[in-house]
Structures are given as C-alpha cells and as structure tokens.
Interface confidence: low
C-alpha cells in the first residue's frame, strides 16, 4: 500500500521518554498535499488514530493527555495525498517512566575515583527486574543495557568501568524494567555524581567493544570491562 511519496517525520513533544501521568503530543509531518494522517502503533489494531492535517496541512497532531502503560510502544505514521499513501515514517519509540518504583544507584567502592582505577556503578531495584539501564546526562549515547540472559529476574546490575578517565565523570541515573516491555521503565534513580580526580593527563581508554565510530570522548561515557557479576545479565550497547 505504500506509494512513492516521501516518508513523513514523526516525533514527540516534549520528548519520547514521558513520566506516567504527563501529557505528550505526537507530531507527524508530511507534505502540503496531505489530506489525512494516520498513526499506527505496533501490536495494536491499525490505524491506531487518524487526524486531519493542521493548516498549512503539512502536519498532524496526536495528543495523549495522560501517559499510561497503554500508550508506551513503537509508532509509525503515514499521510494520504491525492496520489495515495506515503511510505511509513521511521519508528518512534514512546517510553513511559514511573512504571515501577525507583532503583538505587551507588558507586563501589566510592563515587570519588582516581583516574586509572576501577569503579562499579550498582543499580539496585526494589523488586526483581530483568533489565537495567544506566544513563549519563548529556551523553549522545546514554543508554547501557544489562539484560538477563534467560528472563531471570534479579535485584541488581553492576556496570563496571575500568580504567576510569575524565570521560567517565558526570551525573548518572539508572532505570529498571521488565524485558516483556522495554517501553516501560521505573522511576529514575536519584542522580549519582561520579567524580574523577587526577585525570588531566590521562589518555583516552580503549573501549572493550565498539560503541559508536562517530562518537567523540564526551559521547562515550561508559566503557565497561570484565564480566558481569551474578552473571545472568548480558551487556547490551544501545
């Protein structure tokens, strides 16, 4: 059914990670010839919603007044013009936080670490979870997943960093989640400030696996090494 029309652009305001109960607006922008916009949500009957275009007809608004679990998921949009339906937009993943109680984030042995040494960030949840995410503020690639191998649910994940350099310093938060829906996250943990001392002359560490070929030092907050203790957890770079 997809025609030769260019695909629309899909985005969410104020963003794609929304706290439970907050409002979010999904925008789909097509062309001035658009007559109708359609939003599809994966694993839901299509279309999930239809909207007439807003003047000057090149976009449509889909409103979610109060975010709940039902709205979390993967969306695509299309527009219809006189010559048919467009190709689908790139997917938008709408994530809800606040689905579970907040985990605790701590640094072992200490959040004050000397450059060249090792530190482990420990994310502990109140209930057993099978996915943990570590996020560094203002990082281009902020998400590090630890996901259990066999669906085993546990209370903690360890994010080892070694050797530590100035790149690792900054503010971290973690989330926990159940693998059956990675669109539902816990409340964020309280922030943890990792302070790296004596790092002015440090060379950049080599990551144990490639993170992003285009990323510079500030885009690579985490370079975990070694195995994950309690190993049912598998490391994923996102």
């Amino acid at each position: 059914q997809a025609g030769p029309l260019p695909k629309p652009t899909l985005w969410a305001e104020p963003g794609s990670v929304i706290s439970w109960g907050n409002s979010v607006t999904i925008w789909c922008q097509g062309t001035l010839e658009a007559r109708e916009y359609r939003l599809d949500k994966e694993e839901s009957p299509a279309p999930w919603d239809r909207q007439n275009p807003l003047e000057p007809k090149n976009k449509a608004r889909f409103s979610i007044p109060s975010m709940t679990e039902d709205y979390a998921g993967r969306y695509r949009c299309y527009y219809r013009s006189p010559v048919g339906w467009s190709q689908p937009s790139d997917p938008l993943e709408l994530v809800m936080t606040g689905a579970y109680s907040k985990p605790t984030l701590s640094a072992l042995p200490s959040p004050l670490v000397t450059s060249g040494k090792s530190v482990t960030l420990l994310c502990q949840s109140r209930s057993p979870m099978d996915t943990f995410l570590l996020i560094k503020e203002r990082a281009a690639h902020p998400l590090l997943h630890l996901r259990s191998e066999h669906g085993a649910q546990q209370h903690q994940a360890e994010f080892p960093m070694s050797p530590v350099t100035s790149v690792h310093g900054g503010t971290y938060r973690c989330f926990s989640s159940h693998g059956f829906s990675h669109y539902l996250l816990s409340h964020p943990s309280d922030p943890l400030e990792l302070i790296v001392s004596g790092s002015l002359e440090d060379p950049r560490p080599s990551p144990t696996r490639s993170v992003s070929t285009a990323a510079g030092p500030e885009d690579q907050p985490l370079m975990p090494t070694g195995s994950v203790p309690h190993s049912g957890l598998r490391r994923h770079w996102e």
Partner: antibody, heavy 117, light 107 residues
Framework: EVQLQQPGPELVKPGASVKISCKAS????????MHWVRQRHGKSLEWIGH????????VYNQRFKNKATLNVDNFSSTAYMELRSLTSEDSAVYYC??????????WGQGTTLTVSS | DIQMTQSPASLSASVGETVTITCRAS??????LAWYQQKQGRSPQLLVY???TLADGVPSRFSGSGSGTQYSLKINSLQPEDFGNYYC?????????FGAGTNLELK
C-alpha cells in the same frame, strides 16, 4: 507506626468470590509494594503476588494468576485482593504485607477464609 | 522457580540453649533471603533480611549467615518467647518462595 488492618473471618460458598481488604496507615502508601501471602492450616506460606500502588502494576505468582486479582484505592490507602471460583482448597489465612524490597517488614493480622457449603 | 529446603522440620530445645536452622535454595539467591518468626495464631514477624541484617527491634541473640545457596539462622541463649515457627524466604526472583518451616518447641 505502620499498620495493616485486615477484616475478620469470611465464610463463603464454593464457586463464589470474595474480596479481602487491607487498610494501610503510618507510611506513604504509594511508596511500597503491597504483597499478599496465603497460609493454609498448619502449612507454610505461599506468596500470591504484589501490587505497586503508585500506578497499580501487579506481579503474580503464576500459580495464582487465575485465582487472585489485586488492586488498590490510593485515596483510602487500601489494597484489595479478590479471589474467585472458590473451592475448599482456598480455605486459608490470607495476609497482606508491606514489601520493603522483596521481604515483608510489616504484616496484616490475616483474614481467615473458610470455603464451605 | 527457586525451591527453599528448610531443616530441621522440628526442633526441641531448652531455654538458654543455642540452636541453628538452615535453609538451602535450589539456585544461587545472592543473599536475597529473609527469616521470619511466627507464633501460634499470629502473623509472621520479620527477623532478618539480606541474609544477615537484623530487622528493627530484633534481639541480638538472633543472627543470620550464609551465601550462595546455603543459609542459616542462629539463636543464642534461647528465651521463652523464641519458641514458635520459623520460615526462610528468598526474594531473588519471582515467584518469591518460603521454606516449609521449622517448629521450635520447648523441650
């Protein structure tokens, strides 16, 4: 002081349903999971499931998935467990318990359920 | 599911004695273990969590130990109020499960 208040004994007929309440006080209700635990006469304890009052999310022991439904009323700080299609096998004491993590630091006094015709 | 095997099933002891109750998990539960005391006709009371941390108000004669799959609860210098049933419970993964219990009775 944390308190979990449960009603007295319930006598119900086979095939019926019952809803057991657990009124919490002395702490912020939405901050802790509320668990439910069953104890048959002279037997050990069985974990039924828990609910996170902040948003109603539940986790069930698969053994009780088709037997129990958990919900909460945050305005009254009360948790509820509905048990359906009751048989004599469901006769037991049912406890609500506050979950600090996955251990239970405060328990209700228990509600004795007797299923009999 | 992780199974908890508790032993002994029953135990007779006298006031002033020291007793130990053990619990074995069918898998590694990484110290996510709690111990409860339950007296006849009463609700269980938390004694120990995280395998070795005493709950608020629990006398120091109680102590928990262990790691991996093997855990124990030790009661030094038994007091009259210590007699009753004791249960272990893991909370490492769903579903949480309890041991079958140990009935500690006065000899």
């Amino acid at each position: 002081e944390v308190q979990l208040q449960q009603p007295g004994p319930e006598l119900v007929k086979p095939g019926a349903s019952v809803k057991i309440s657990c009124k919490a006080s002395g702490y912020t209700f939405t901050d802790y999971n509320m668990h439910w635990v069953r104890q048959r006469h002279g037997k050990s304890l069985e974990w039924i499931g828990h609910i996170y009052p902040y948003n109603g999310n539940t986790v069930y022991n698969q053994r009780f998935k088709n037997k129990a439904t958990l919900n909460v009323d945050n305005f009254s700080s009360t948790a509820y467990m509905e048990l359906r299609s009751l048989t004599s096998e469901d006769s037991a004491v049912y406890y609500c318990a506050r979950g600090a993590v996955g251990y239970f630091d405060h328990w209700g006094q228990g509600t004795t359920l007797t299923v009999s015709s | 599911d992780i199974q908890m095997t508790q032993s002994p099933a029953s135990l007779s002891a006298s006031v002033g004695e020291t007793v130990t109750i053990t619990c074995r998990a069918s898998g590694n539960i990484h110290n996510f273990l709690a111990w409860y005391q339950q007296k006849q006709g009463r609700s269980p009371q938390l004694l120990v969590y995280n395998a070795k941390t005493l709950a608020d108000g629990v006398p120091s004669r109680f102590s928990g130990s262990g790691s991996g799959t093997q855990y124990s609860l030790k009661i030094n210098s038994l007091q009259p109020e210590d007699f009753g049933n004791y249960y272990c419970q893991h909370f490492w993964s769903y579903p949480f499960t309890f041991g079958a219990g140990t009935n500690l009775e006065l000899k």
